[in-house]
Interface confidence: low
């Protein structure tokens, strides 16, 4: 193993950890022969887990299936067989378990029904799966039931006949509110957006669909767009890609008022074989990927202004495969403004890039300390870290997990990677950053599954192996020191780690199966780390940490998007519980403005290595294809616009004469009443 010491060794004194963990390890053997297992957490901090096991035998004419349903209310330590609550019915795994939002306690399971039935069947629970009610549906569902984020009693579903069905009483009664529906989504305030086909079918009418909205669950409707190819919601933005009049290209239009008014996004149009993709969106802005023409496998990332209209080029040659639809774009949720993705270079090698300022600037990931550059590096002393994400996983490289970060584990990022000039196909190692991606260190040798517990107080890992395993590794100091714990004397074929979403739990469940000559038996081991972190953390266990600090001498050190944040973080040497109620303590302070806090407004751009915005020469004296709210519009600008989410105050204010940009609206999208409005310039 590359000369490294045996991985079963560890460091860091945690007295009697073996005895403490042995007393807190709970095994559950599932008494069935199922081929697959799915697991869902019900609610937050409830400890309730539902496990659905399915066993399917394909017969000549039909397939015979059997499901079993198990429930735990102690974070997986014990399970009870509750299959009788669903009348021993076979549950369709492709619909999964539809768990209600927040702590509603609602669960919907979709059952398999015989061929001639009038409609589908669901089992509904609103008490965290203690009881289920069987309900026969007046339609056959095509998709999983979708809960309204605002009211978990409101559900929508599409039928196999493309009907849009709505329930106002948690699936007890259903009403078909529209036919010929292709795609439906909940928006804010219980609004439903959906596209309909007018002539033939969803596929045939692609680019000729209509976008509709209902704000009262189907009593009244408004057509908010025509010639639609597709639509999406991101943050406070509603996006639609709309076919152009003259050719087969399409453009993105944006609305921030639920589709009442639309503006054409200043993004390149795309042809039939290309696509747009919303990579990330929040209340302030959006990252948009625009595919390159041809089957290149890459495109360009653009970042928007606060209106979602004006876009700045953020990153060229952004890897996004057309075939599998894979991109490595990752929001590092443990530090504001940080994103990691991959680019495809001219020689077809893939390289990782990171931004710390929400797409303003991208750079390579710093080489981990004490690491050697691999065979991909031209210069053996200068190289960078490259992160494996979705694309590597799709290519069946030895990467069991995508990068991991948690908002309440400040600064921690864990990912598989390699050190060189590009991503390597060699077996990766696991790397960790404790400062949001500025610096990295090798955490574990070889591929692992990993998860964060107790808001970063514990990191757990299991080696990725095709052999049965019985060792779990854990660290109480953000991945520096690792202890190994043998959780069972009988190794299991490992299938997954499960911990409660949100990384606040101290329990981890190790799932797998034992296999004899003809039978496979599912088993879970739940390890509770509460006795390892045996005391609650106190004030002295935390230390202050300035995020994004790169130059402590500079008064602007730590300033990102106009403000800096100081966090209280657990000391690495403190072995204590953050606890379930832990709230990240942060102290923001506003920074003075500089040109870096502004993006260039429409009609302006920043020349390479310059900080000032200058007027785009090709736009001088031209009519501009720009459509703001679809009205005749005179747009005034001084060429600068504050970056979305930027909170800087004082300092530099880019003052220059305000120009009148006469715009010509050439979009024929918009609402029928507003179409083709023009202004002469």
């Amino acid at each position: 193993r590359r000369g490294a010491p045996a991985e079963d060794q560890d460091c860091g004194r945690l007295p009697d950890f073996i005895a403490k963990l042995t007393n807190n390890t709970h095994q559950h053997v599932f008494d069935d022969l199922s081929g697959s297992v799915s697991l869902s957490w019900v609610g937050d901090s409830t400890g309730v887990i539902l496990v659905l096991t399915t066993f399917q035998v394909p017969l000549v004419i039909v397939s015979f299936g059997q499901s079993k349903l198990y429930r735990s209310e102690d974070y997986g330590k014990n399970f009870k067989d509750i299959t009788n609550l669903i009348n021993n019915t076979f549950i369709r795994t492709e619909f999964g378990m539809a768990i209600g939002p927040e702590n509603s306690g609602k669960v919907i399971l979709t059952a398999e029904v015989s061929g001639g039935s009038r409609g589908g069947r669901v089992f509904r629970s609103s008490d965290f799966a203690k009881n289920f009610v069987q309900t026969d549906l007046p339609f056959h569902p095509l998709t999983q039931m979708m809960y309204s984020p605002q009211n978990s009693d409101y559900l929508l579903a599409l039928s196999t006949e493309n009907g849009l069905w709505v329930s106002k009483n948690f699936g007890e009664k259903w009403e078909e509110i529209h036919k010929a529906v292709c795609l439906a989504k909940w928006g804010p305030n219980n609004i439903i957006f959906f596209t309909t086909h007018v002539n033939g079918s969803c596929k045939a009418d692609l680019g000729a669909l209509e976008l509709w909205r209902t704000s009262d669950l189907g009593k009244t409707f408004k057509t908010i767009g025509v010639k639609i190819y597709s639509f999406g919601l991101g943050g406070r933005f509603l996006f639609a890609s709309v076919m152009a009049d003259k050719d087969t290209t399409r453009r993105i239009h944006v609305s921030t008022d639920q589709g009442d008014t639309w503006s054409m996004a200043q993004l390149p149009s795309v042809g039939q074989e290309q696509f747009y993709s919303i990579l990330a969106a929040n209340e302030d802005m959006v990252f948009m990927h625009v595919d390159e023409p041809g089957d290149t496998g890459f495109g360009t990332i653009f970042t928007s202004d606060d209106r979602g209209i004006v876009y700045s080029k953020s990153l060229d040659r952004h890897l996004y495969t057309t075939t599998g639809g894979e991109t490595d774009f990752t929001n590092v949720t443990s530090l504001r403004g940080v994103y990691i993705t991959s680019t495809l270079s001219e020689d077809n090698s893939i390289q990782s890039m990171i931004t710390f300022d929400q797409g303003g600037r991208w750079e390579h990931l710093r080489k981990p300390e004490n690491s050697k550059c691999d065979a991909t590096a031209k210069n053996k002393n200068e190289c960078s870290l490259h992160i494996h994400a979705s694309y590597s996983i799709s290519q069946k490289l030895n990467v069991p997990m995508a990068p991991l970060s948690e908002p309440n584990a400040v600064g921690i990022v864990i990912a598989h990677g390699s050190v060189g000039d590009a991503i390597s196909v060699m077996v990766p190692d696991v790397y960790i950053s404790d400062d949001g991606g500025y610096s990295w260190a090798k955490m574990l040798e070889g591929p692992h599954y990993y998860t964060i517990l107790d808001s970063g107080g514990i990191i757990v890992a299991i080696e990725h192996s095709n052999r049965p395993i019985n060792v779990i590794k854990f660290s109480t100091d953000e991945g520096q020191c690792w202890q190994s714990y043998v959780f069972t004397q009988e190794p299991i074929y490992f299938t997954g780690l499960a911990s409660e979403p949100g990384a606040r739990s101290m329990n981890i469940s190790i799932w797998g199966f034992t296999e004899s000559f003809i039978t496979r038996q599912w088993v879970s081991y739940t390890v509770d780390f509460k006795d390892i972190l045996e005391r609650n953390c106190e004030e002295d266990d935390y230390t202050t940490w300035l995020a994004h600090s790169t130059d402590p001498g500079d008064y602007k050190d730590g300033c990102i998007l106009g403000y800096k944040e100081q966090f209280l973080r657990l000391r690495k040497s403190s072995v204590c519980q953050n606890g379930r109620d832990y709230v990240v303590a942060k102290q923001p302070s506003v920074c003075p403005c500089s040109l870096e806090d502004f993006l260039c407004d429409f009609g302006y751009f920043r020349p390479e290595n310059a900080s000032e915005c200058v007027e785009q020469p090709e736009l001088k004296g031209h009519e501009l294809e720009f459509c703001l709210y679809g009205k005749e519009e005179h747009l005034t600008t001084n060429g600068y616009r504050k970056i979305p989410g930027d909170k800087c105050q004082g300092g530099m204010n880019p003052a220059r004469e305000v120009k009148d940009l006469k715009k010509k609206c050439t979009s024929n999208f918009l609402n029928p009443t507003k179409q083709n409005s023009k202004s002469n310039s």
Epitope: Q9, D477, Q480, S573
Partner: antibody
Framework: QVQLVQSGAEVKKPGASVKVSCKAS????????MSWVRQAPGQGLEWMGI????????SYAQKFQGRVTMTRDTSTSTVYMELSSLRSEDTAVYYC??????????????????????WGQGTTVTVSS | EIVMTQSPATLSVSPGERATLSCRAS??????LAWYQQKPGQAPRLLIY???TRATGIPARFSGSGSGTEFTLTISSLQSEDFAVYYC?????????FGGGTKVEIK
Amino acid sequence: QVQLVQSGAEVKKPGASVKVSCKASGYTFTSQYMSWVRQAPGQGLEWMGIINPYGGSTSYAQKFQGRVTMTRDTSTSTVYMELSSLRSEDTAVYYCARDPSGIAAAGPASRYYYGMDVWGQGTTVTVSS
Amino acid sequence: EIVMTQSPATLSVSPGERATLSCRASQSVSSNLAWYQQKPGQAPRLLIYGASTRATGIPARFSGSGSGTEFTLTISSLQSEDFAVYYCQQARLGPWTFGGGTKVEIK
């Protein structure tokens, strides 16, 4: 109190094997690693390897790979070190030492190496024809 | 493997004087370093771990410093019982390795 008691002195012929025992008391035997270190007459200390008494897993120095075997008996809280194919240069005092930190899996250095904090009294092994 | 080099091999010091012992690693061992004292006919005794932390029961006249590749053990005022051989040991990467030792003798 915490102590490690080793077996008595041994005289062996070249080519033979020797098995030294180290009995631990005063702490939870399976919770701490155990290293073996030897010292030839008038020479310095040489680390031979380490054993995890809980799982029984081991890691040996390359020099001793294939000749050394470290085992443990949890029922008696004893670790054993067996060295085979003895040669005259194996004449040394052999120590077991509790090593609470074990070996870092990889990557970021442990900020907490605790050292070998408890040592056995040593076992003299003489290899002579 | 990481090679640990101690200097000087022998240090002659009068009682009450200060003794400074050096240990250099062939590559960074971070702070994964320990110091031991060994007297003739006895097993080694742990003095310092983590490069700078005194082990339980070790007098305050012993102090350790350094990280990475350069380390120092300082005995601020030598007592008669301090004349012995001192070894440094790294635990950054397996195999653990010891320095050749520094013998502190009475001047």
